[in-house]
């Protein structure tokens, strides 16, 4: 592989690494969305919530003079509940959690697939760099692109989840905004998907420049 190609691959791998870090951050944190309740004028506190793939946290926040709930960073009594994804026999509460649970199961499962693809891609890259097997960069690139697509699907599932929670008559939440975990997931999708495509492009053998050349005539990579 030529020096310029190697440099492009390294830059791409650095972008992919950033995507991996962001994807991991998004998966393990629970600030995908922040939900605010309907405001009651006579209440001195309000209960905002933030959630991720694995749990929802509610927080009692003192209300300010503007009668708005938040920001969620204000100090308050925090209470987190994990979504029990893997014990479906349990009766679930019909309010916040049921709607959330069915979507978060899907999003979490898809996110795990994404992490699986990231691990496979990373193994291919490590083997490629260690043994100078450049052809392994091609499956790695595909794994990273698939990981990016899985993250995108997770993002969309969570978006639908937020929409359902806001539209539901059974939840107290009436306003929402997407938070930093969601931004991490979106950035991870862009970096992994585009990085995967770029890596595939850079790891392919040079295409023949002239009509009479064949791929076999191209200079060997090693």
């Amino acid at each position: 592989m030529s020096q310029t190609k190697m440099l492009k691959v390294r830059v791409t791998l650095f972008c992919i690494l950033a995507g991996i870090v962001l994807a991991m951050t998004a998966v393990v944190t629970d600030h995908w969305a922040v939900l605010s309740p309907h405001m009651e004028h006579h209440n001195t506190t309000c209960e905002a919530a933030h959630f991720g793939l694995w749990r929802i946290c509610t927080k009692r926040i003192p209300m300010d003079d503007s009668k708005t709930c938040g920001p969620i960073t204000l100090p308050g009594e925090k209470n987190c509940s994990y979504f029990r994804h893997f014990n479906p026999g349990e009766s679930s509460e019909i309010f916040e959690f049921t709607t959330q649970k069915e979507y978060s199961i899907s999003a979490a499962a898809i996110a795990i697939f994404s992490l699986g693809f990231i691990i496979l891609g990373s193994l291919c890259v490590l083997l490629s760099l260690g043994k100078k097997r450049d052809y392994l960069l091609r499956p790695a690139s595909m794994f990273y692109a698939f990981a990016g697509l899985c993250i995108l699907v997770s993002v969309e599932v969570m978006r639908q989840s937020v929409k359902r929670m806001i539209d539901s008559e059974d939840t107290v939440w009436i306003e929402y905004y997407y938070s930093w975990s969601f931004a991490c997931a979106c950035a991870a999708f862009i970096l992994l998907f585009l990085g995967g495509l770029a890596l595939l492009l850079f790891s392919l053998p040079r295409m023949p420049r002239n009509p009479w050349e064949s791929c076999m005539d191209a200079e060997p990579e090693h």
């Epitope: 309907h38 509460e93 019909i94 539901s168 008559e169 059974d170 939840t171 107290v172």
Partner: antibody
Framework: EVQLVESGGGLVQPGGSLKLSCTAS????????MHWVRQASGKGLEWVGR??????????EYAASVKGRFTISRDDSKNTAYLQMNSLKTEDTAVYYC???????????WGQGTLVTVSS | EIVLTQSPGTLTLSPGERATLSCRAS???????LAWFQQKRGQAPRLLIY???SRTSGIPDRISGSGSGTDFTLTISRLEPEDFAVYYC?????????FGQGTKVEIK
């Protein structure tokens, strides 16, 4: 002024059918879940069932005592909810109220009630 | 389904006294999914408390709710003449929604 008005009550024989209506004025019901609650004379309140909003695909839930016999429906364009009661039994005799829940607004408005008497 | 048991069945008190009404659930309903209603003769019920402890608009602060899990309490610190009525607890934590059998607060 917000008003929920039930209609359609009356005397019916056991095994018969009746359809109750609940129409709202001064309040848009489309976002809310609509519930029916009944109360036999001198007895407590009994939740009959509810129909959820469009976002929740108009899903219905019923008390065990009426499941399979009663059907709740709604027409958001008419701001009306319905309770279709089939195979009526004498123990279904009660005042039927309609109410709603939306977000923290749980059963904040009620109708005046309509009396259903099941008797031969 | 979750069965709610209210006690006592009847509470006989004088105006100015403290009333404590209990509601026990057959299984946990969480802290957010219990409401209290007041019903006077010939009238539709009126929501007093939702989420176990949040007062609805227009409810005086002498009326308060507390509890979580399976044990809930409605307290009226000083009974006024208009407080004599039947009180129902209701859970909305799991379907089917259920009411307690009611507690009648009557004048001594």
């Amino acid at each position: 002024e917000v008003q929920l008005v039930e209609s359609g009550g009356g005397l019916v024989q056991p095994g018969g059918s009746l359809k109750l209506s609940c129409t709202a004025s001064g309040l848009t019901l489309s976002d809310s879940a609509m519930h029916w609650v009944r109360q036999a004379s001198g007895k407590g309140l009994e939740w009959v069932g509810r129909i959820r909003n469009k976002a929740n695909r108009y899903a219905t839930e019923y008390a065990a005592s009426v499941k399979g016999r009663f059907t709740i429906s709604r027409d958001d364009s008419k701001n009306t909810a319905y309770l279709q009661m089939n195979s009526l039994k004498t123990e279904d005799t009660a005042v039927y109220y309609c109410t709603r829940n939306w977000k923290i607004f749980l059963f904040d408005y009620w109708g005046q009630g309509t009396l259903v008497t099941v008797s031969s | 389904e979750i069965v709610l048991t209210q006690s006592p069945g009847t509470l006989t008190l004088s105006p100015g006294e403290r009333a404590t009404l209990s509601c026990r659930a057959s299984q946990s309903v969480g802290s957010k999914y219990l409401a209290w209603f007041q019903q006077k003769r010939g009238q539709a019920p009126r929501l007093l408390i939702y989420g176990a402890s949040s007062r609805t608009s227009g409810i005086p602060d002498r009326i308060s709710g507390s509890g979580s899990g399976t044990d809930f309490t409605l307290t009226i610190s000083r009974l006024e003449p208009e407080d004599f009525a039947v009180y129902y607890c209701q859970q909305y934590g799991s379907s089917p929604w259920t009411f307690g059998q009611g507690t009648k607060v009557e004048i001594k």
